[in-house]
Interface confidence: low
């Protein structure tokens, strides 16, 4: 017997077919134990990690991962060539840039080599699973006496593929002011008070032109501008993670 289970996921583009099969029709006593879900993220379009929770297995099992693309010259699965391990048990696979094709459906199969009938297949849209590097080289310049411009750089990914979240606050502010900047790695603040000290930081995501990734990068290193006078209450101005 076999059954198909549709798994819901935080990423609505991910659909997984869990194919559960018993060894023989006369042995219907216990269904095959489901396999853990595979989660993949493409890091800055440099490499991809597909990982699973190996500790969810009742006994230590070196699960194997095979993958292919839905539309490709060769429709056979290829096995992971670079496994990631947790406590000496396979818990993921790292796939290099040459094997990443963002705009083809990525088909990934997790299998228990001891029980080949125990396998799970998932289909992923990789363009929605890109996590960029944190923006770098933040620089501030004066456009005029009271107007500041912040610029930054993103490595390896075209700027127009990224959306940026800029946060800034002065030493008098209790919270960040934030705004979305699309595609252009710059932001100008029309009015600054030279008696205040400002802090800026930026993060990015691969959205919405080239993909629909909801995952933000890490925050950039903060940059500061303005008065170096001692803040009245420094504890208010520590950067949150």
């Amino acid at each position: 017997w076999s059954s198909k289970v549709l798994m819901s996921s935080a990423n609505e583009d991910i659909k997984a077919d869990l194919i559960l099969t018993s060894t023989a029709p006369e042995h219907l006593s216990a269904p095959t134990l489901p396999l853990p879900e595979v989660q993949c993220f493409v890091f800055n379009i440099e490499y991809m990690n597909c990982t699973w929770n190996s500790s969810s297995e009742p006994q230590a099992t070196n699960l194997t991962l095979h993958y292919r693309y839905k539309v490709s010259d060769n429709n056979t699965f290829q096995e992971c060539s670079h496994y990631l391990f947790s406590k000496e048990i396979t818990s993921g696979c790292q796939i290099q840039k040459e094997d990443i094709q963002l705009y083809q459906t990525f088909v990934v199969q997790l299998q228990d080599p001891q029980k080949p009938q125990r396998r799970a297949v998932q289909k992923l849209n990789l363009q929605n699973l890109v996590i960029p590097r944190a923006p770098e080289n933040l620089t501030l310049s004066n456009l005029s006496e009271s107007q500041l411009e912040l610029r930054w750089k993103s490595r390896h990914i075209k700027e127009r593929c990224l959306q940026y979240l800029v946060q800034y606050r002065s030493n008098r502010d209790r919270s960040w002011t934030e705004l979305i900047v699309n595609h252009e790695p710059r932001f100008s603040l029309p009015s600054v008070d030279e008696l205040k000290r400002y802090t800026f930081r930026v993060r990015s995501r691969y959205n919405p032109i080239c993909g629909s990734s909801q995952q933000w990068s890490k925050w950039s290193q903060p940059v500061h501008w303005g008065s170096h006078t001692v803040e009245e209450n420094p504890s208010l101005f520590a950067l949150e993670a």
Partner: nanobody, 129 residues
Framework: QVQLQESGGGSVQAGGSLRLSCIGS????????MGWYRQAPGNECELVSS???????YYADSVKGRFTISRDNAKNTVLLQMNSLKPEDTAVYYC???????????????????????WGKGTQVTVSS
């Protein structure tokens, strides 16, 4: 101003050949993928062939073995040699430069198509039986 200019389109009998050429100006395209898309009336925009900055080529199944893509980074050009043309190859062919090799469909060729940064205006290819 960044521009992509296609040339080489025209009318040909089935089984004939055409060579499309695209030249980019206003920007060095050597880090971009460059490719050819096509759109027939009533159809979606589809990727015909693309070539990455390192020369790796991709071909749609429908053109494999018949079309050959090449590029010259120094001259910002990409060429598409089309042999054994079929009536179903009739379409407007667009040159594009962009971020990654592109897959999937979009309703119309142009800026909104996944990550391709620059587009030409298109050249008509008509293949009659």
């Amino acid at each position: 101003q960044v521009q992509l200019q296609e040339s080489g389109g025209g009318s040909v009998q089935a089984g004939g050949s055409l060579r499309l050429s695209c030249i980019g100006s206003g920007l060095p395209f050597d880090e971009d993928d460059m490719g050819w898309y096509r759109q027939a009336p009533g159809n979606e925009c589809e990727l015909v062939s693309s070539i990455s900055s390192d020369g790796t080529a991709y071909y749609a199944d429908s053109v494999k073995g018949r079309f050959t893509i090449s590029r010259d980074n120094a001259k910002n050009t990409v060429l598409l040699q089309m042999n054994s043309l079929k009536p179903e190859d009739t379409a407007v062919y667009y040159c594009a430069a962009g971020v990654h090799r592109q897959f999937g469909g979009s309703s119309s060729c142009g800026d909104a198509f996944y990550g391709m940064d620059y587009w030409g205006k298109g050249t008509q290819v008509t293949v009659s039986s």
